[in-house]
């Protein structure tokens, strides 16, 4: 149960994560204009991953699409590389994912599949989550660079008399969604690659013992018992000398630290 | 088509207060910025504020904070401008105006006439 | 504030006759973000409102004749009128539609000789 549980909780919150790289991918919010200790302008800007924005104080909004990719700052590029690896290699997990999933049955797929592909899954999905936050974490850094730059030569201007006032950017309400849709992504992933382990075939913990019957001679090998898929009880596979004989099902219906993840 | 009505002529007393109103027809009136600028007689220009009447949200400018006080009523698609504690000073042409592209004011009320004297 | 710098004060000007009026900031109202000068032109007649002429420096509002140009960048815009008609006798006004407070020059007046 408890398996099941850390597999569809792992799925949900993978799920709720690559939404969010998405959406953060798509927001125009990256960066926003710095509004602390500026002049009080009738407009506002903010810049996102493929469009930058102006909303002028009459409400009208304005956005203006980068349709050069040569012209675009190499940081800028690998920030979308980053994402949209990361919306990828997620997706693909959770198609793996749906079908690794404990609770749904397709065909006679055996649990050692399930968990190979629970496996992948979670694996993708890390390294979906990491992608996003490096990402984010790259474009942040940007911002910051940026931000003192432009904060030291903040004015120009002819001997003090016309100034010019860059505009400064901070961080934009993307960013916070990106870093907390990666780190969602990220523990999906690693509540899938623990239950992953919850799923793998068990080794037995007794030693091949021969049988000599009549005729010919038969070796039972251990490991050969195949994990329950969860539907209906498998009271033919017992667990030898775990310290009684226990069904897999009340196996799973014990707590685990599983339960609480 | 786009109309800012505005209120009558006022003859005001010093120290008195006059609210005068800036009625919108002919467009949505929560969509818009509703600016109000002074005229003095013969004399340039000068910005006081502004109201949202989306949400009641102002903006004025330091010189004309707690002389004035914008208000709005979504109801009536109606503006208001108060002034209190009027002087001389205080005597000129009040005018609305609605915002848009490029943050200009592109329809401006008729104006409003306010003259203070004892 | 804002500082809006209008010259010259005033403009003689015969019917035909071409004329450029000027309007300086202390700032650049220039924003980078849409590459857009925040600048407006009004012209306003005795006993009347201000009218919108241009926004955005260049962009004339609809039912602006053509022959009211607005031109410039960063601090320094100019108003042109290629030919003056008589109708075009009024002040003209520029304002900085970039930082709050909003702020407007002192005008222009376009005079008949």
């Known amino acids: 149960m408890a398996v099941t549980a850390c597999q569809g909780l792992g799925f949900v919150v993978s799920l709720i994560g690559i939404a969010g790289i998405i959406a953060a991918t798509c927001m125009d919010q990256w960066s926003t204009q710095d509004l602390y200790n500026n002049p009080v302008t009738a407009v506002f800007n903010y810049q996102g991953l493929w469009r930058s924005c102006v909303r002028e104080s009459s409400g009208f909004t304005e956005c203006r699409g980068y349709f050069t990719l040569l012209g675009l700052p190499a940081m800028l590029q690998a920030v979308r590389a980053l994402m949209i690896v990361g919306i990828v290699l997620g997706a693909i997990g959770l198609l793996v994912s749906i079908f690794a999933l404990k609770c749904i049955r397709i065909g006679s797929m055996e649990d050692s599949a399930k968990a190979n592909m629970t496996l992948t899954s979670g694996i993708m999905f890390i390294v979906s989550g990491l992608c996003a936050i490096a990402g984010v974490s790259v474009f942040a850094n940007m911002l910051v660079t940026n931000f003192w730059m432009s904060t030291a030569n903040m004015y120009t201007g002819m001997g003090g008399m016309v100034q010019t006032v860059q505009t400064r950017y901070t961080f934009g309400a993307a960013l916070f969604v990106g870093w907390v849709a990666g780190g969602l992504t990220l523990i999906g992933g690693v509540m899938m690659c623990i239950a992953c382990r919850g799923l793998a075939p068990e080794e037995t913990n007794y030693k091949a013992v021969s049988y000599h019957a009549s005729g010919h001679s038969v070796a039972y090998k251990p490991g050969g018992f195949k994990a329950s898929t969860g539907f209906g009880s498998n009271t033919k596979n017992k667990k030898i000398y775990d310290g009684g004989a226990r069904t897999e099902d009340e196996v799973q219906s014990y707590p685990s630290k599983h339960d609480y993840v | 088509e786009v109309q800012l009505q505005q209120s009558g002529p006022e003859l005001v007393k010093p120290g008195a207060s006059v609210k005068m109103s800036c009625k919108a027809s002919?467009?949505?009136?929560?969509?818009?910025?509703m600016h109000w600028v002074k005229q003095k007689p013969g004399q340039g220009l000068e910005w006081i504020g502004y109201?949202?009447?989306?949400?009641?949200?102002?903006k004025y400018s330091e010189k004309f904070k707690g002389k004035a006080t914008l208000t709005s009523d979504k109801s009536s698609s109606t503006a208001f401008m108060e002034l209190s504690s009027l002087t001389s000073d205080d005597s000129a042409v009040y005018y609305c105006?609605?915002?848009?592209?490029?943050?200009?004011?592109?329809?401006w009320g008729q104006g409003t006439s306010v003259t203070v004297s004892s | 504030d804002i500082v809006m710098t209008q010259s010259p004060s005033s403009l003689t000007v015969t019917a035909g006759e071409r004329v450029t009026m000027r309007c300086r900031s202390t700032?650049?109202?220039?924003?980078?973000?849409?590459?857009?000068?925040?600048l407006t032109w009004y012209q306003q007649k005795p006993g009347q409102p201000p009218k919108l002429l241009i926004y955005?420096?260049?962009t004339r509002e609809s039912g602006v004749p053509d022959r009211f140009t607005g031109g410039g960048s960063g601090t320094d815009f100019t108003l042109t009128i290629s030919s003056v008609q008589a109708e075009d006798l009024a002040v003209y006004y520029c304002?900085?539609?970039?930082?709050?407070?909003?702020?407007f020059g002192a005008g222009t007046k376009l005079e008949r000789k």
């Open positions: 304002q900085n539609a970039y930082y709050y407070p909003l702020t």
């Open positions: 700032q650049s109202l220039f924003n980078s973000g849409n590459q857009k000068n925040y």
């Open positions: 955005w420096a260049s």
């Open positions: 109201i949202n009447p989306y949400n009641d949200g102002t």
């Open positions: 105006a609605r915002l848009d592209y490029g943050n200009a004011m592109d329809y």
């Open positions: 002919g467009y949505t009136f929560t969509g818009f910025l």
